[in-house]
Amino acid sequence: MMTGTIETTGNISAEKGGSIILQCHLSSTTAQVTQVNWEQQDQLLAICNADLGWHISPSFKDRVAPGPGLGLTLQSLTVNDTGEYFCIYHTYPDGTYTGRIFLEVLESSVAEHGARFQIP
């Protein structure tokens, strides 16, 4: 039975040209995390594998950085970066857990960050 829950940064906003940290955390399970995938809609941004470390998709190499921890840092944000982001935790023996974050990139300087690790 899958008992775990994913906590995420929830709905967040950031300024165009700035950077943002996307973070998820899997709790309430003793399952071993073997890999975490970060995806934007249907595009793979990055993979963090427990044995092999990080792999950043070549098309995002200049704007995506790993960390902090299992999180992902997005840099040089554009309005086109607005949308849904998913952290996909591959675990044993539970299987797959998915967390969702919605990022809105704003033109103005009134971007407000959502509360950290709110359950969406």
Epitope: A50, W54, P66, G67, P68, Q75, R116
Partner: antibody
């Protein structure tokens, strides 16, 4: 097996700068963040920042911005930290450590820096 | 920044005794890492993601906690466990460490 080999102890004058190295082996250098941590007897462990050698991204503790500069040379799998405008407060042991999402799993042996006036 | 406070700077325990050391954070964090360091050596990853034991760590060690309160427990103290233990968080930038708990053998 991952291994991090740090450069030797440094005795440097106040006001000068120092550049230490951390040579990585036994793993893919560009797939892990490389952190630097300061340790002093009275202050414990302080996180300085990290570099991701895969694209050169750096993330600094604000307290060390302008004091420390992190770089990496992927051709030699070596990370560097330069500390400038040294004062007695910078006398410490500096560790490099590898991190791939699940805490800092491999540490170098440390580089001791002593600042003399 | 989040400040981590380790309950005791120094603890002493007899062989076979149960030991619990705590780490409290000034704000809620999602998980905690623990490192063991013996005199003159580098720190070693000991417990990560609150409760997962690093490779080679004896099963007598365990970690638990949530929110602002975390702990490391040794079910039965052994001589080789004498060391300094540091907690570390990275739910919030910058990463911070506790001041350490030095565990001595009685």
């Amino acid at each position: 097996q991952a291994y991090l080999q740090q450069s030797g102890a440094e005795l440097v004058r106040s006001g000068a700068s120092v550049k230490m190295s951390c040579k990585a082996s036994g793993y893919t250098f560009t797939s892990y963040n490389l952190h630097w941590v300061k340790q002093t007897p009275g202050q414990g462990l302080k996180w300085i920042g990290y570099i991701y050698p895969g694209n050169g991204y750096t993330n600094y503790n604000q307290k060390f911005k302008g004091k420390a500069t992190l770089t990496a040379d992927t051709s030699s799998s070596t990370a560097y930290m330069q500390i400038n405008s040294l004062t007695s407060e910078d006398s410490a042991v500096y560790f490099c450590a590898r991190e791939g999402g699940w805490a800092m799993d491999y540490w170098g042996q440390g580089t001791s820096v002593t600042v003399s006036s | 920044q989040i400040v981590l406070t380790q309950s005791s700077a120094i603890m002493s325990a007899s062989p076979g005794e149960k030991v619990t050391m705590t780490c409290s954070a000034t704000s809620s964090v999602s998980s905690m890492h623990w490192y063991q360091q013996k005199s003159g050596t580098s720190p070693k990853r000991w417990i990560y993601d609150t409760s997962k034991l690093a490779s080679g760590v004896p099963a007598r060690f365990s970690g638990s906690g949530s929110g602002t309160s975390y702990s490391l427990t040794i079910s039965s103290m052994e001589a080789e466990d004498a060391a300094t233990y540091y907690c570390q968080q990275w739910s919030s930038n910058p990463s911070t460490f506790g001041a350490g708990t030095k565990l001595e053998l009685k």
